[in-house]
């Protein structure tokens, strides 16, 4: 399955989008910053198998898609923005759900997949914790903000690499 | 390979105006934000301030607050350090450095090799 | 503003030498703590991050621990190119500030 071109520009839109988002100073918030521990190597790209990347991939997409869905989310950020934002996650996760067919019917996917997706889930749910404890607060939601934009750039950067071993 | 290249030494004279600069290459120059750095002949490190070139948003120390201008040009991915009217006293090294933003990753991890300024009549 | 206070502000050791600085802060800073090495004429380079975290490329002989007010940067085994100048800095907020620095010096 080819991602295409589309895909990749989707994701630099999300993340335009996201950049925009911010509703105040992050200089505010510095001492809020918090170590939710990235599973860095689920982006690694080279240990995998083009199935694994996809799915990890799509993981990825959906728990943001998620996060920013929540009611909490609608009331932390600029509605226009946030719609936007989500319908680009929404066009990723469509692109990303064909070839998750196409590949696994290629390739059995291993255990090894299902330990990158629990990792991707688990940081998701730290990064949720961290929400919570912070009660939602202006400052935990710049924090959050600026660790999905890390995110998501390690995630266009596994999209090339992919694209390159096509 | 990450580097940030700063503009080199100035002599200039006390009331004059100066703006040095400080180049980001080998990474996303929006994903970070720059801080400059003080260092006067024999002496320690101060902070100046700080800037996020993704949207020019700024934070100073109360020390330099109203004596420089911090700004930055993303199209070219450079950072700026000015003086309206220098000093003698701003006689120092100048560094600029980039910190991970709000993100959890290594403060002021890559430095630039500095900016000597001599301001003398 | 949070006041950086290092210990000692110079200090003579031996190359092989077991070494200790102190930084202490005038509020918690949880561990919100860098330090940074510097040589003459040269830009300050980050050995420790967030109290006790090593920079890549570091070697393991340089160690950080400490949280709230007290840190300790350590050098297990002094070596040559070891000698210069080493500063705290807290990154726990604005304004961003420095220890005055302690110089290490060949015995």
């Known amino acids: 399955c080819d991602l295409p071109q589309t895909h990749s520009l989707g994701n630099r839109r999300a993340l335009i989008l996201l950049g925009q988002m911010g509703r105040i100073s992050p200089f505010s918030c510095l001492k809020d910053r918090h170590d939710f521990r990235i599973p860095q190597e689920e982006f690694d790209g080279n240990q995998f198998q083009k199935a694994q990347a996809i799915s990890v991939l799509h993981e990825m997409i959906q728990q943001t898609f998620n996060l920013f869905s929540t009611e909490d989310s609608s009331a932390a950020w600029e509605q226009s923005l946030l719609e936007k934002f989500s319908t680009e996650l929404y066009q990723q996760l469509n692109d990303l759900e064909a070839c998750v067919i196409q590949e696994v019917g290629v390739e059995e996917t291993p255990l090894m997949n299902e330990d990158s997706i629990l990792a991707v889930r688990k940081y998701f749910q730290r990064i949720t914790l961290y929400l919570i404890e912070r009660k939602y607060s202006p400052c935990a939601w710049e924090v959050v903000r600026a660790e999905i934009m890390r995110s998501l750039s390690f995630s266009t950067n596994l999209q090339k690499r992919l694209r390159r071993k096509d | 390979e990450v580097q940030l290249v700063q503009s080199g030494a100035e002599v200039k004279k006390p009331g004059e105006s100066l703006k040095i600069s400080c180049k980001g290459s080998?990474?996303?120059?929006?994903?970070?934000?720059i801080g400059w750095v003080r260092q006067m002949p024999g002496k320690g490190l101060e902070w100046m301030g700080i800037?996020?070139?993704?949207?020019?948003?700024?934070a100073y120390s109360p020390s330099f607050q109203g004596q420089v201008t911090i700004s930055a040009d993303k199209s070219i991915s450079t950072a700026y350090l000015q003086w309206s009217s220098l000093k003698a006293s701003d006689t120092a090294m100048y560094y600029c450095?980039?910190?991970?933003?709000?993100?959890?990753?290594?403060?002021?991890?890559?430095w630039g090799q500095g900016t000597l300024v001599t301001v003398s009549s | 503003d949070i006041q950086m206070t290092q210990s000692p502000s110079s200090l003579s050791a031996s190359v092989g030498d077991r070494v200790t600085i102190t930084c202490r802060a005038s509020?918690?800073?949880?561990?919100?703590l860098n330090w940074y090495q510097q040589k003459p004429g040269k830009a300050p380079k980050l050995l420790i991050y967030?109290?006790?975290s090593l920079q890549s490329g570091v070697p393991s002989r340089f160690s950080g621990s400490g949280s709230g007010t007290d840190f300790t940067l350590t050098i297990s085994s002094l070596q040559p190119e070891d000698f210069a100048t080493y500063y705290c800095?807290?990154?726990?907020?604005?304004?961003?500030?420095f220890g005055q620095g302690t110089k290490v010096e060949i015995k």
């Open positions: 080998g990474y996303s120059f929006t994903s970070y934000w």
């Open positions: 450095a980039r910190h991970p933003g709000l993100n959890w990753a290594p403060d002021f991890d890559y």
């Open positions: 800095q807290q990154s726990f907020d604005f304004p961003l500030t």
């Open positions: 967030f109290a006790s």
């Open positions: 509020q918690s800073i949880d561990r919100a």
């Open positions: 800037i996020d070139p993704s949207d020019s948003d700024t």
